[in-house]
């Protein structure tokens, strides 16, 4: 039983919606923090009712765990909440964003967004000095993150009046245009967020908390680790199998993800002489489709065929290559007669409506 | 067993409301989405409302909006759909299906047997 | 009117193939999964074929679901008597946000 159309359906829908979910975020949480994760639509398009589902298996809601439109929310985190969480889109389970929870039983400095501390500054009725409302929370001085990920760096505190924060990044003070992709200052929740890290971000970032009574301040080392360089990744069931009508028009689909710059070609296996492969047991292949001076990667992710033949029948390539290797995905081609051809052999047994 | 059983149904003037339920048993119904087919005699199927557990999302057909509400009651595994100014035309046969796993795609696996709903004067 | 087109009717003797016809655009069927409802006189709709191509178990292999572009199909070889029943395509459709029926197909066993 062909599959073919679901996993073709799945590519489709990534185009429409836009970009396909990036790396997957790694995320640090303590015992005990709520653990947020946010999964606005690609593309702004409408996608529909989303789901959570947390190592393969659809989250519920429940008192602990609050779902929303692209939001998902677990309170009071515990070892047994870490894993890998995935938003999708509840008809087609595209995975919109892919996330891996870790909680630890040290608390974490991450941004736990869960509002506590607000309240608790609430209850400042002293004037006086900043203090730290959740030093526990403040003791991973250093954080090591693959590039591409999310950081957050949190210093929650209290004070009368209620202090203001600031960030240094080596000791300078950091604004957003410092860096591509800007940050976030979450001010109520004490919080630096930086997106998409890179090697550059590299560093001491000290937060500083202040008001007229005194200054209290907290310094965290963050290293970059360099993504390892791997051969092209083929997404998982493209391109696929597909059953087409005689004429009628066909497209394979080949998503492709690759750091270093990829190289896509589209081949069709072929016979040669009666054989499929050479002597050294190469297959015979022809080259379809490959990079000109003015395709795009995106129009190479795609093989369009026209009209189909019969000739069209069988096994397609997708070939990606980088400096680093190879990687190919294959897809078969049935065709079929035309609706007409079926009407005619309506002796043979078969008839088509519609 | 998967069983879907609607009432609620009978006969109502237009411009009247009337509530339908649907009691669910043989599978954990608060981690199902669920939905309201209608079927008007004679007709096809028409997709009314669909409630979703996986972000709370509840999703209405353009003919019913603004006039229909659909609701769950987890604890009491029963599926609601109250029908405010009812017309001529919403005249049918409603039945409650239940979607398969939040993880799995999206399918209408088990339909109740249905209930009448006629809005006459 | 239905947002996807179905032929109205379809027959065919015992032991044919029938292939019924689901016409719809990119907002439905073009970027959305397909399923397929049987649905026997005076009885509710019972799922035929899911994400395309899918048979839920219990569900005979003479059924099948295929799909290209924005058209859907379901293919019932072998035929038998009990198979004459009403056949609806259905598929979520993004510009309406909601799920859409066709209009149904009546198959009729010669």
């Known amino acids: 039983e062909s599959l073919g159309t679901e996993q073709r359906v799945v590519g489709r829908v990534a185009e429409v919606s836009g970009p396909e979910p990036s790396q997957q975020e790694q995320l640090v949480f303590g015992s005990g923090d709520a653990v947020e994760l946010s999964c606005p639509p690609p593309g702004g398009g409408p996608m529909g009712p989303t789901v959570w589902v947390k190592d393969g298996a659809g989250l519920v809601p429940s008192e602990r765990v609050l779902v929303g439109p692209q939001r998902l929310q677990v309170l009071n985190a515990s070892h047994e909440d870490s894993g890998a969480y995935s938003c999708r889109q509840r008809l087609t389970q595209l995975v919109l964003c892919h996330f891996s929870v870790r909680v630890t039983d040290a608390p974490s400095s991450g941004d736990d967004e869960d509002g506590e501390d607000e309240a608790e500054d609430t209850g400042v009725d002293t004037a006086g000095a900043p203090y730290w409302t959740r030093p526990e929370r403040m003791d991973k001085k250093l954080l090591a993150v693959p590039a591409a990920n999310t950081v957050r760096f949190r210093c929650p505190a209290a004070g009368n009046p209620t202090p203001s924060i600031s960030w240094l990044k080596n000791g300078k003070e950091f604004r957003g245009e410092h860096r591509i992709g800007g940050i976030k200052l979450r001010h109520q929740q004490w919080s630096l967020v930086m997106e998409s890290v890179v090697p550059s971000d590299r560093g001491n970032y000290t937060c500083v908390v202040e008001n007229k009574f005194g200054s209290i301040r907290q310094t965290y080392t963050l290293d970059v680790l360099e993504r390892s360089p791997h051969r092209p990744i083929l997404q998982a069931g493209l391109p696929a199998n597909q059953t087409a009508v005689l004429g009628s028009d066909v497209e394979f689909h080949c998503k492709v993800y690759s750091d270093a710059q990829p190289h896509i070609q589209w081949l069709k296996h072929v016979e040669v002489n009666g054989s499929k492969v050479g002597p050294d047991g190469t297959p015979y292949v022809t080259v379809l489709k490959t990079a000109g001076a003015n395709t795009t990667d995106k129009e190479l992710e795609v093989l369009s065929l026209h009209n189909v033949t019969f000739e069209d029948a069988g096994e397609y390539t997708c070939l990606a290559g980088n400096s680093i290797g190879f990687s190919h995905h294959s897809a078969w081609l049935v065709v079929l007669p035309a609706e007409e051809e079926l009407v005619e052999a309506d002796e043979a047994g078969s008839v088509y409506a519609g | 067993e998967v069983q879907l059983l609607e009432s609620g149904g009978g006969l109502v003037q237009p411009g009247g409301s009337l509530r339908l339920s649907c009691a669910a048993s043989?599978?954990?119904?608060?981690?199902?989405?669920m939905s309201w087919v209608r079927q008007a005699p004679g007709k096809g199927l028409e997709w009314v409302s669909g409630i979703y557990s996986g972000d709370g999302s509840i999703y209405y057909a353009d003919s019913v909006k603004g006039r229909f509400t659909i609701s769950r009651d987890n604890s009491k595994n029963t599926l609601y759909l109250q029908m405010n100014s009812l017309r001529a035309e919403d005249t049918a046969v409603y039945y409650c299906a239940k979607d398969a796993p939040t993880n799995e795609m999206s399918r209408f696996d088990y339909w109740g047997q249905g209930t009448l709903v006629t809005v006459s004067s | 009117q239905s947002v996807l087109t179905q032929p109205p009717s379809a027959s065919g003797t015992p032991g044919q193939r029938v292939t019924i016809s689901c016409s719809g655009s990119?907002?439905?069927?073009?970027?959305?999964?397909v399923s397929w409802y049987q649905q026997l006189p005076g009885t509710a709709p019972k799922l035929l074929i899911y994400a395309d191509s899918k048979r839920p178990s219990g569900v005979p292999d003479r059924f099948s679901g295929s799909k290209s572009g924005t058209s859907a199909s379901l293919a019932i070889s072998g035929l038998r008597s009990e198979d004459e029943a009403d056949y609806y395509c259905?598929?979520?459709?993004?510009?309406?946000?909601?799920?859409?029926f066709g209009g149904g197909t009546k198959l009729t066993v010669l």
């Open positions: 990119s907002s439905n069927i073009g970027n959305n999964y």
């Open positions: 259905a598929s979520w459709d993004y510009s309406l946000s909601g799920y859409v």
């Open positions: 043989g599978f954990t119904f608060s981690s199902y989405d």
